[in-house]
């Protein structure tokens, strides 16, 4: 498909001249950021960004690649080096420590320097590193965490927790020896390490005692509370704050977000991770966009500003399943949340960053025609005389041999939301990838986001932009009209 | 491997504070660029950049990812959308048209708008688009093309040629019907379309009549001249310029580059593409770094400045073979050329861009330990109880079934320069990938390289920075001390 207007060189020359004009007009703001938002696309490498752009464009009846994601509109871009101290290819725990705390850690640890060792409780104390969210709170800002995973998951936990094992969601997940040594589960740390104004995502079951039925799935024992210590952490959290409210469904969330008496809001919408956007019950569970909007409504009441972490956390899960349909539809919802946040905030006073913690071994090749489905087949056949998809994985659960050969695939099969793209190597879960990821930036001090940087740089840019520790002597003018 | 200094948060905090300090000091230059250099890593997607960084670092006895490529030091980064008008995943012809001429074209066409159709000679005339190199020449600058492929290959051809078929290297490759319609082969266009001061790379055989023995392989008929029109294009080119010199080996190149009487230099060092860096005979063939240095020595004599295209063209070839060793060692040599050029030029007057035309379905996953070989095995075994490499391809010739199963692999096998990494789909040649690629920029107007852009933007930034057509009214101050 060749769009007739694109045949004319004037189309491209005009477009580029406009882009040049916009580039020339870019003026680095010399003011401080009142508000900080970090949008984290878990597993959203550059190949995911491009494929999602095409899909989002095609959902709007365009050919695809010529369209813009919300993140594409951010004026500044950098590349982020994601390795952890001990691994070339990292996990979401060590990376969260990097972009939220500004220090690199070890694989599967969270909020700890690399002096801490995975699963060794006694290496925790003294190695804690403090997140930018924590520093923002100490500076009088309101703070929030929004995710489509459980709120105790690795990425959001980087904002508030310190643990040698990212899998210690509730005390039931922590070995008795570690509990005795004083290591706390992540759910406990969520409510006790610091005062978080808004907590939205999944993860109900880690907050309640074993045997507590889940409100949404009361008859399903596997979805109920998991805690061994008998604590009701939601109750404990509510008791801490006069204006605290706990909600577990969409209706309650929308009500609470508009209620001026609510100062603190915890919304846990699933026992574990939230459902994929394509599986979401839209009456029961809010979308990431709705959670982001609710969080912004509450947080933006604070005249001193806010810090908000928003995670599209299940992009990663779709890729681990080698189900690109899930990964890409999650990316689109993540981008929709970015777009909505842009409408609800001003780039005059809000530094917004979009990045990924790491990539995936996910590729988009095969010379498909423009406008063809991102989930479709490459033109022609492979060496084995069978069709193949343009989307493929290096490794993962999509590897299958059928009668000792690679299975054939049709366009309707590959377009299915359940289809697993093929891989070179069979694994239970497709792995992360180690290449640099993009950082997109907009707002005060966004111009500092440049070149190729360590992932830790992200936390430092946020801290500097808002004049938080250790950059309180930032020498940035407050934005005209900001109140304190 | 955990470096002890990296266990200390101060290591990361200090490093990030330094990076912030450098970012704050960045001052967009308001001057014009006297010189333009575009370094094109053919097929050098972000996954290739990261893997090459690790390999280059490890060759210097470092762990790898913490080190810097020369391109990593460039202060500005953007992402480039590489699709062609007709394909989601492009080739090197359509992309060359984009980044060198500023207009997107169709797959496998070069220097033509998308009104031209692949292989249809009669769609050529009237659809030619003019490269920045051509515009630079018209503005009185010296211009050069350096590549490790044949100089008539798709990428360099984008600087000077207009053809509906990128494979029309010599007239022997052009169908008689197209020749009759007036379509010229690329080699002919190399010497006749415009005056190019420096031409260095491979591609001897396309310049000489059929039956002309090659000087390096005189007994190998397949390496001799291919032309049917009986023309000796080298002779024709030499006759055009008083100070023209033709060389075909390293010794002659080094001599010519230091000879002040040489005004024009053509060096063709292989009949076809140049040899991979790991196969190069260092007495006969120059490296890409040496060719770049020779080009700069000649071009920098012009007080009006120069335009130089430098291509690491065989990164792409290594990937097409699913031989990551070749692709990554080519990338390192490409980066070495960038480094050398940086030493020989000033960022005060030279805008240098580094980018790729497209990516490849090449991934780097599997959670390897820091410091482990980039060509090594992932920890643990796959579902089929066999080892697997951290580097893999989505598709390509590395797909093999042995007795109806995926072959096992050892560390020594995977470390071999001949080893083909496995892929999900068997193809004769691994394909390009469609995700955005990075653009690295340094020098005057480099700050315009920002955000997510169409690949065409690159040509426009170069033209604007040097006040070339259509931006002659660029309103940029010439650098203090520039001469005309």
């Amino acid at each position: 498909i060749i769009p007739v207007e694109e045949e004319n060189p004037d189309f491209w020359n005009r477009q580029a001249a406009e882009a040049l004009g916009a580039a020339k007009k870019l003026q680095p703001a010399q003011t401080a950021a009142k508000n900080l938002i970090i949008f984290l696309g878990d597993g959203m490498g550059v190949s995911t960004v491009t494929a999602a752009r095409i899909l989002k464009g095609q959902k709007k009846d365009k050919l695809g690649p010529e369209t813009f994601l919300a993140m594409d509109r951010f004026p500044y871009v950098a590349l982020s080096k994601t390795y952890s101290v001990d691994k070339h290819v990292p996990d979401s725990g060590a990376t969260a420590t990097a972009y939220l705390c500004g220090v690199k850690g070890n694989f599967q640890t969270i909020g700890l320097s690399a002096a801490a060792r995975f699963n060794q409780c006694n290496t925790t104390r003294g190695n804690e590193v403090i997140s930018v969210m924590n520093r923002a709170k100490k500076a009088g800002k309101s703070v929030g965490v929004v995710t489509t995973t459980r709120v105790q998951h690795a990425s959001p936990a980087g904002a508030y927790a310190h643990t040698v094992n990212r899998n210690w969601y509730s005390d039931a997940d922590v070995p008795a020896s570690a509990r005795q040594e004083g290591c706390q589960d992540i759910a406990t740390q969520l409510i006790s390490n610091m005062d978080i104004d808004v907590i939205l995502g999944g993860g109900r079951k880690y907050m309640f005692p074993m045997g507590t039925p889940d409100p949404e799935y009361p008859d399903d024992y596997s979805q109920g509370g998991t805690r061994l210590d008998g604590k009701n952490l939601v109750q404990e959290w509510l008791a801490k704050h006069q204006g605290a409210r706990y909600v577990w469904n969409r209706t309650e969330l929308l009500q609470a977000s508009l209620d001026p008496s609510v100062t603190h809001l915890m919304g846990l919408f699933e026992p574990g991770d939230m459902k994929y956007e394509i599986h979401r019950d839209s009456t029961l569970d809010p979308s990431l966009m709705e959670m982001t909007e609710a969080a912004l409504l509450l947080l933006s009441r604070n005249p001193r500003g806010f810090f908000l972490f928003v995670e599209g956390g299940r992009i990663d899960h779709g890729h681990h399943e080698s189900r690109a349909y899930r990964a890409l539809t999650e990316t689109i919802m993540f981008d929709d949340a970015i777009e909505r946040a842009g409408q609800l905030t001003s780039e005059e006073d809000t530094l917004s960053l979009v990045t990924a913690d790491h990539s995936h071994v996910f590729s988009f090749g095969g010379y498909p025609l423009r406008g063809s489905s991102i989930f479709g087949l490459a033109p022609g056949k492979a060496r084995d005389r069978k069709a193949y998809t343009v989307l493929l994985y290096g490794n993962g659960p999509g590897y299958v041999l059928k009668d000792g050969a690679r299975p054939d695939v049709t366009e309707s099969e590959s377009g299915s939301p359940e289809y697993r793209q093929q891989s070179a190597v069979p694994l239970d879960g497709e792995t992360h990838a180690g290449e640099d990821v993009a950082v997109f930036a907009r707002g005060p001090q966004a111009h500092l986001v440049h070149g190729v940087q360590e992932q830790t740089f992200i936390a430092h840019v946020m801290a500097f932009a808002a004049c938080l520790e250790p950059y309180t002597a930032c020498d940035l003018a407050p934005r005209a009209g900001t109140t304190d | 491997i955990i470096p002890v200094e990296e266990e200390n948060p101060d290591f990361w905090n200090r490093q990030a504070a330094e990076a912030l300090g450098a970012a704050k000091k960045l001052q967009p230059a308001q001057t014009a660029a006297k010189n333009l250099i575009i370094f094109l890593g053919d097929g050098m997607g972000v996954s290739t950049v990261t893997a090459a960084r690790i390999l280059k670092g490890q060759k210097k006895d470092k762990l790898g990812p913490e080190t810097f490529l020369a391109m990593d030091r460039f202060p500005y980064v953007a992402l480039s959308k590489t699709y062609s008008v007709d394909k989601h995943v492009p080739d090197s012809g359509a992309t060359a048209t984009a980044y060198l001429c500023g207009v997107k074209g169709n797959f496998q066409t070069i220097g033509l708008s998308a009104a031209a159709r692949f292989n249809q000679c009669n769609t050529t005339r009237g659809n030619e688009v003019i490269s920045v190199m051509n515009r630079a020449k018209k503005a009185g600058k010296s211009v050069g093309v350096v590549t490790t492929t044949r100089v008539q290959h798709a990428s360099p051809a984008g600087a000077y040629a207009h053809t509906v078929n990128r494979n029309w290297y010599s007239d022997a490759d052009v169908p008689a019907s197209a020749r009759q319609e007036g379509c010229q082969d690329i080699a002919t266009q190399l010497i006749s379309n415009m005056d190019i001061d420096v031409i260095l790379g491979g591609g001897r055989k396309y310049m000489f009549p059929m039956g002309t023995p090659d000087p390096e392989y005189p007994d190998d008929y397949s390496q001799g001249g291919t032309r049917l029109d009986g023309k000796n294009l080298v002779q024709e080119w030499l006759a055009k310029h008083q100070g023209a010199r033709y060389v075909w080996n390293r010794t002659e190149l080094l001599q010519a580059s230091l000879d002040p009487s040489v005004t024009h230099l053509m060096g063709l060092f292989e009949p076809g593409d140049m040899k991979y860096e790991i196969h190069r005979d260092s007495t006969l063939d120059p490296s890409l770094m040496e060719m770049t240095e020779a080009a700069l020595l000649l071009l920098s004599r012009n007080p009006r400045g120069f335009f130089l295209f430098v291509e690491g063209g065989r990164i792409d070839h290594g990937h097409h073979e699913s031989r990551a060793y070749r692709a990554l060692t080519e990338t390192i040599m490409f980066d070495d050329a960038i480094e050398r050029a940086g030493q020989l030029t000033s960022e005060e007057d030279t805008l240098s861009l580094v980018t790729a035309d497209h990516s490849h379905v090449f991934s780097f996953g599997g959670y390897p330990l820091r410091g482990s070989s980039i060509f090594g095995l992932a920890p643990g075994k796959a579902r089929d109880r066999k080892a697997y490499t951290v580097l893999l391809y989505g598709n390509g010739p590395g797909y093999v079934l042995k007795d109806g199963a995926r072959p096992d692999v050892t560390e020594s096998e995977s470390g071999s320069p001949e080893y083909r990494q496995q892929s999900a789909v068997p193809l004769d040649g691994e394909t390009h990938a469609g995700e955005d690629v990075a653009v690295f920029a340094r020098g005057p107007q480099a700050h315009l390289v920002h955000g997510v852009q169409e690949q065409t933007f690159i040509a426009h930034v170069m033209a604007f920075a040097a006040c070339l057509e259509p931006y002659t009214a660029c309103d940029l101050a010439p650098r203090a001390g520039t001469t005309d």
Partner: antibody, heavy 123, light 106 residues
Framework: EVQLVESGGGLVQPGRSLRLSCTAS????????MSWVRQAPGKGLEWLAL??????????EYSASVKGRFTISRDNSKSILYLQMNSLKTEDTAVYYC??????????????WGQGTLVTVSS | DTQMTQSPSSLSASVGDRVTITCKAS??????IAWFQYKTGKAPKLFIH???TLQPGVPSRFSGSGSGRDYTLTISSLQPEDIATYYC????????FGQGTKLEIK
Amino acid sequence: EVQLVESGGGLVQPGRSLRLSCTASGFTFTDYYMSWVRQAPGKGLEWLALIRNKATGYTTEYSASVKGRFTISRDNSKSILYLQMNSLKTEDTAVYYCARASFYYDGKVLAYWGQGTLVTVSS
Amino acid sequence: DTQMTQSPSSLSASVGDRVTITCKASQDINKYIAWFQYKTGKAPKLFIHYTSTLQPGVPSRFSGSGSGRDYTLTISSLQPEDIATYYCLQYDNLYTFGQGTKLEIK
């Protein structure tokens, strides 16, 4: 409470057509995948057709045995699922169930079933 | 398409016996298997999903296990009310039922 009620079964001659309906209540109909499953006398359960939810564009899938003859569709305004059965054969005689998927552990298991409606194809 | 081979097709056991039914998939189904109990004249009832997760109200004597291509339903101590036909269902790639196992009391 999730409820699925099938209707439209009965006796039909070979070669003729029949449309089954399944009226759904107790959940947001547009958010769920719906399927038809049948059980022929003395035989096992056989999945026939699937229609996905709004988020995935209500795309459809069929088993090889009914592809081209049966069509699954839905009326979202009325929360009704349909199965249009054409060119019926005697071997299509079965109890036809409509079923709703639940997305446990990100799978799409058939968690809720109607009581079924009997279709007899006979001359 | 993924095929499911269920065995045995019928099984006679005594009350209190340990009963095992197996299903083998033609390809890896990534633990996306469910087990249904079917009694004549009633709708099939979901007992286990995602290999081993018991549905609410299902007695704990029922358990599921497996991975890759091989999966098992186990009744640790057979009770009279367990007499029924049991079906496995793969739902990794669309849906495929096993042929069923008819369970009888000796």
